[in-house]
Interface confidence: medium
């Protein structure tokens, strides 16, 4: 062929048109082509219909072609592998009717910010789905229902803050799940179902250790040998499991599977049996696990905050356990924001007097509690994040910007870590600084109205502010996965102006509840 290299390997006719500065499919390719490489061209848009004459095509590589649009028309009846990685796709084309035999789909390192509910409809043969390195924040709950044969799923290195409870329902063949390097703070109860998941990669998420993490903690304990840290170039079967890689973000990197869960509600007559209906509550000390009960009784229909019932921490070790960093996905609307007191041993709060109710936000519909399987709506348009646009621009550095909130803590992982895209002229502050964190932990999805009518000491005077609160991700390391080098998200930087100088922002104020 005048443009592309043609080679026959066994029964495959392979055509290599990589890096030929092509803007369209070259003419007169062999009609019996089975593998077609079109990587590193300048296609921008591409129509799969142009490949219909190649009825034996089983593998198509369209990676690194600056694709902004893939037109799906016609049918490629035997195409099994499609590589769309490293393009500029902002939406996932609906491939089901065009590619009914697809078994491997790679859309890694594109610009996907969301997936429609029926994104995978018609892809009943799909076995491997790679969505690594996009900008996904949420997933529709029935996303994988059309792909019951799925074996490998990579959602690593996205901006996922939560997962639909039923995401993995019906995926009996799933053996590898890659969720590392996201913004996940909890796993919904029942998420993993009952089937075995041999290889799970969960590290590099800001897991929020509180009463809502107990289902996940128990799953980790029961599946410790199936939790791994990804090492590039190492076959997954040769890796060593490392359940300790899943760490509490709010408790000095304490492994989630060892989280004590002190003060959390237990199953019982007066407890909310919907909260933890998969595993009984336990108190873990070292390697010993013992059942516990607590005298705290909760209203049966209490709505939980993303850090669980917000008073769930044991007061015995608050200094080491209280969260002090922001967690997604607080919307940056100009709503009243209340800073409740830090829960310290020197005041009393009668639990029965606290009620929780969801209140509508001014910009969106009420968001469901993350303990349900309902999808969370897309963030409001005014959410302050650094999401890419078709022509992304990072702010030009200034000579003296504020210090970065990210503190580089070296870990043993062999990959680079993200820092804020905003440049700094001074080193990041030391994590050991005793100064109180200016931005307390914030609630995610649900908006909680707290009505506390019982005894609160004067120290717990509430502070209100109408300043917008934006998002801060925890700094993380990344591990490359599934033969794809890593993507690290930039830190989404939060600003709460002048809070450091506010006399009411006492160290004892820690947790932000939006109203």
């Amino acid at each position: 062929h005048p443009i592309c290299e043609v080679s026959k390997v066994a029964s495959h006719l392979e055509v290599n048109c990589d890096k030929r500065n092509l803007t369209a499919l070259p003419p007169d390719l062999p009609k019996d082509t089975t593998i077609l490489h079109l990587s590193e061209n300048l296609l921008y848009t591409f129509s799969l219909a142009t490949l219909m004459p190649y009825t034996r095509l089983t593998q198509l590589n369209l990676d690194r072609c600056e694709l902004t649009k893939l037109q799906v028309d016609g049918t490629l009846p035997v195409l099994g592998t499609l590589d769309l990685s490293h393009n500029q796709l902002q939406s996932l084309p609906l491939l089901g009717q065009t590619l009914p035999a697809l078994t491997v789909l790679d859309v890694s390192f594109n610009r996907l910010t969301s997936l429609p509910l029926g994104a995978l409809r018609g892809l009943g043969e799909l076995q491997e789905l790679y969505l690594k390195g996009n900008e996904l924040k949420t997933l529709p709950p029935g996303l994988l229902t059309p792909t019951p044969k799925l074996e490998k799923l990579s959602l690593a290195n996205n901006n996922l803050t939560e997962l639909p409870a039923g995401l993995l329902n019906g995926l009996e063949n799933l053996d590898t799940l890659l969720l590392q390097e996201n913004s996940l703070y909890t796993i919904p109860k029942g998420f993993f179902g009952s089937h075995l998941l041999p290889f799970a990669f969960l590290h590099g998420n800001p897991w929020l250790c509180n009463c809502e993490i107990l289902y996940f903690r128990r799953w980790l304990q029961d599946n410790a040998e199936n939790v791994y840290v990804w090492k590039q170039g190492v076959d997954v079967k040769a890796m060593t499991s490392n359940v300790a890689s899943v760490q509490c973000d709010n408790s000095d990197k304490f492994p989630v599977y060892k989280y004590p869960g002190k003060g959390c509600p237990t199953l019982g007559d007066e407890g909310d049996t919907d909260l933890y209906d998969y595993y009984p509550e336990e108190d873990t000390e070292g390697d010993k696990v013992r059942a516990t009960r607590t005298v705290v009784k909760f209203p049966t229909k209490a709505h939980t905050t993303p850090w669980g019932l917000f008073y769930s921490w044991s007061t015995a070790s608050l200094d080491s356990q209280m969260p002090s960093s922001l967690h997604p996905t607080q919307e940056s609307t100009k709503e009243q924001t209340t800073f409740p007191p830090r829960w310290t041993p020197n005041f009393t709060l009668h639990m029965e007097s606290i009620t929780f109710s969801k209140t509508p936000k001014s910009t969106t519909e009420p968001t469901p509690s993350p303990t349900t399987s309902e999808p969370v709506p897309e963030p409001a348009p005014n959410m302050t994040t650094l999401e890419p646009t078709p022509s992304p621009t990072t702010p030009e550095p200034t000579s003296e910007p504020a210090p970065s909130p990210t503190t580089p803590e070296p870990t043993s992982e062999p990959a680079p870590s993200p820092t804020t895209p905003e440049p700094t002229s001074e080193p990041a502050p030391s994590p050991t600084t005793p100064e109180p964190t200016p931005i307390p932990t914030i609630a995610t999805s649900p908006t909680i109205l707290v009505s506390a009518t019982s005894l609160i000491t004067p120290k717990s005077t509430f502070l209100t502010t109408t300043k917008p609160v934006s998002l801060l991700e925890s700094t993380k390391k990344t591990i490359p996965e599934l033969d794809q080098p890593p993507k690290l998200r930039g830190v989404l930087q939060g600003h709460l102006e002048s809070s450091r100088n506010d006399p009411f922002l006492h160290p004892d104020f820690c947790c932000l509840l939006p109203l």
Partner: antibody, heavy 118, light 113 residues
Framework: QVQLVESGGGVVQPGRSLRLSCAAS????????MSWVRQAPGKGLEWVAS???????YYPDSVLGRFTISRDNSKNTLYLQMNSLRAEDTAVYYC????????????WGQGTLVTVSS | DIQMTQSPSSLSASVGDRVTITCKSS????????????LAWYQQKPGKAPKLLIY???TRESGVPSRFSGSGSGTDFTLTISSLQPEDFATYYC?????????FGQGTKVEIK
């Protein structure tokens, strides 16, 4: 043709800051990942930072928290903000282009020398 | 991190000689999904920027003479100059772009004998 021109190098004291710029031309800047690679005098090449076309930064541990890579697509310019400079940061800093984040560097600038010395 | 080890660190050769430089990685650079080895070779002359010669182990960059070729797979790679020309005297670096952080070999200096 593709051109990358670095600027902003010079002599700076340890602990101080410096900002490098790289002006790009001859290609669609916003579609490519960009990187900084440095070379200490008489030594080999060392990757310093990369930023994807979508604006996501990446760093090795050696500069993490001190260096910040950024880009301004409207100006076709790449930046490297270097804070808390050390003597071992003395090097020629090259700006380089790559198609995707994990791809080879297909075009390089001529470099700008940064000397950190008291 | 993936370590890249080049050998020899320097060599002397004459115009017309066949020159072979090897590069070893501490782990495989083969992407099993596209069967590409993520290894590149660069040439650098004194006072100049590096120039891309070979990528994905064996693909020549456009404009690079055919006397330069690359081979290998997994962890062992080779750059071959079939007939050394005067303009080829330079330092050559291999680089893995398989797993971040990207790492380079220490370089092989090709000098005139």
């Amino acid at each position: 043709q593709v051109q990358l021109v670095e600027s902003g190098g010079g002599v700076v004291q340890p602990g101080r800051s410096l900002r490098l710029s790289c002006a790009a031309s001859g290609f669609t800047f916003s579609s490519f990942a960009m990187s900084w690679v440095r070379q200490a005098p008489g030594k080999g090449l060392e990757w310093v930072a990369s930023i994807t076309s979508a604006g996501t930064p990446y760093y090795p541990d050696s500069v993490l928290g001190r260096f910040t890579i950024s880009r301004d697509n409207s100006k076709n310019t790449l930046y490297l903000q270097m804070n808390s400079l050390r003597a071992e940061d003395t090097a020629v800093y090259y700006c380089a282009r790559s198609r995707g984040y994990e791809d080879y560097f297909d075009y390089w600038g001529q470099g700008t020398l940064v000397t950190v010395s008291s | 991190d993936i370590q890249m080890t080049q050998s020899p660190s320097s060599l002397s050769a004459s115009v017309g000689d066949r020159v072979t430089i090897t590069c070893k990685s501490s782990q495989s650079l083969l992407n099993s999904r596209n069967q590409k080895n993520y290894l590149a070779w660069y040439q650098q002359k004194p006072g100049k920027a590096p120039k891309l010669l070979i990528y994905f182990t064996s693909t020549r960059e456009s404009g690079v003479p055919s006397r330069f070729s690359g081979s290998g797979s997994g962890t062992d790679f080779t750059l071959t100059i079939s007939s050394l020309q005067p303009e080829d005297f330079a330092t050559y670096y291999c680089q893995q772009h398989y797993s971040s952080p990207w790492t380079f070999g220490q370089g092989t200096k090709v000098e005139i004998k």
